[in-house]
Amino acid sequence: GPGPCDGNPCANGGSCSETPRSFECTCPRGFYGLRCEVSGVTCADGPCFNGGLCVGGADPDSAYICHCPPGFQGSNCEKRVDRCSLQPCRNGGLCLDLGHALRCRCRAGFAGPRCEHDLDDCAGRACANGGTCVEGGGAHRCSCALGFGGRDCRERADPCAARPCAHGGRCYAHFSGLVCACAPGYMGARCEFPVHPDGASALPAAPPGLRPGDPQR
């Protein structure tokens, strides 16, 4: 079973030793009592470590209290606080205790002093140029409107990348998407239809006003 010294019942830095019946605390200078809980030290003895501020205990019978500076704890400010043990960094951020301050190193997709801001969250995300935000799998993506691309739809898409204009047609990015300037002898939105020598095209019915070689929108 658990021993009487388990959990260290001795306060104020006292050391515990087991006895046949129970336990015994060996108290540091200035403390006494079964568990070293009674202080015989006053502020005049300077009991507060690490820059702690001592309050009370002007006469020998009165106790004192140490007000500890940030980063320290214990009745005499003798223990350094592991502020990272409180897990202040959210969303899997790495906690760094720098002594004077705490810093969180955030995982990709998160930001803020405590990694509290989810950059991949549609709620705080705007997709430019009429794009819509789509969440999924803990991340987001922008579904961009025609003619735009990139993470936030801020980049003009390259509609000519796939060389959509056939038979030597020249492709131009256009506000409406793309436009093909067809080489002579071809017509259609992508210059896909040959124009027959007699002027008729291979189209089932040529759109009105269409001329051979006309760039098509």
Partner: antibody, heavy 123, light 111 residues
Framework: QEQLVESGGGLVQPEGSLTLTCTAS?????????MCWVRQAPGKGLEWIAC????????TDYANWAKGRFSISKTSSTTVTLQMTSLTVADTATYFC???????????????WGPGTLVTVSS | QVLTQTPSPVSAAVGGTVTISCQAS????????LAWYQQKPGQPPKLLIY???SLASGVPSRFKGSGAGTQFTLTISDLECDDAATYYC????????????FGGGTEVVVK
Amino acid sequence: QEQLVESGGGLVQPEGSLTLTCTASGFSFSSSGYMCWVRQAPGKGLEWIACISGGSSGDTDYANWAKGRFSISKTSSTTVTLQMTSLTVADTATYFCARDVYIDSTIFNFNLWGPGTLVTVSS
Amino acid sequence: QVLTQTPSPVSAAVGGTVTISCQASQSVYNNNNLAWYQQKPGQPPKLLIYAASSLASGVPSRFKGSGAGTQFTLTISDLECDDAATYYCQGTYYSSGWYSTFGGGTEVVVK
């Protein structure tokens, strides 16, 4: 405001090589049709050299006389280069970068020009 | 393909009219793919007219382009001192590839 600036001009020996750079600001090539080079010998007229698609296809067009010695390429979304080899005294000229846009079913409309960079070929 | 411009130079008084001709050795693309440019000394050219007759942005209506196929004309009316420059026509063609050609230029002198 949309701008083009050429750089890389200077004095070069006959049979030497030179690379000119055209840098755009205020727009990116991918949304602007084609980027082209045009040159002008001192006191002479304009002479078209080559064009390259502003998009990722990299399609190019060259004047017949420029094929082989001149090479146009796009090095980023805002820079285009013209590599010139085996230069002769006849290549002495101001070299302009120009943007070719599609307007009303017509092409090779150079609606934006850089100030030009002077290339002098001399021994 | 050759574009021949005439005459050069051409001169006229302030308020007058000049006409510049551009003759192509063969029809330009779509019969209308011809542009006109204005160039002043030490400056790059400036697009004036595209599609043979359409006015480029910011160009005054005193500049007028006309023609089709192989014969084109640039007319400048109500001449101003600022119109003194060299004017170039530019045609676009397709023959197993796209290419463009400039005319030799016409100098306009305003008296």
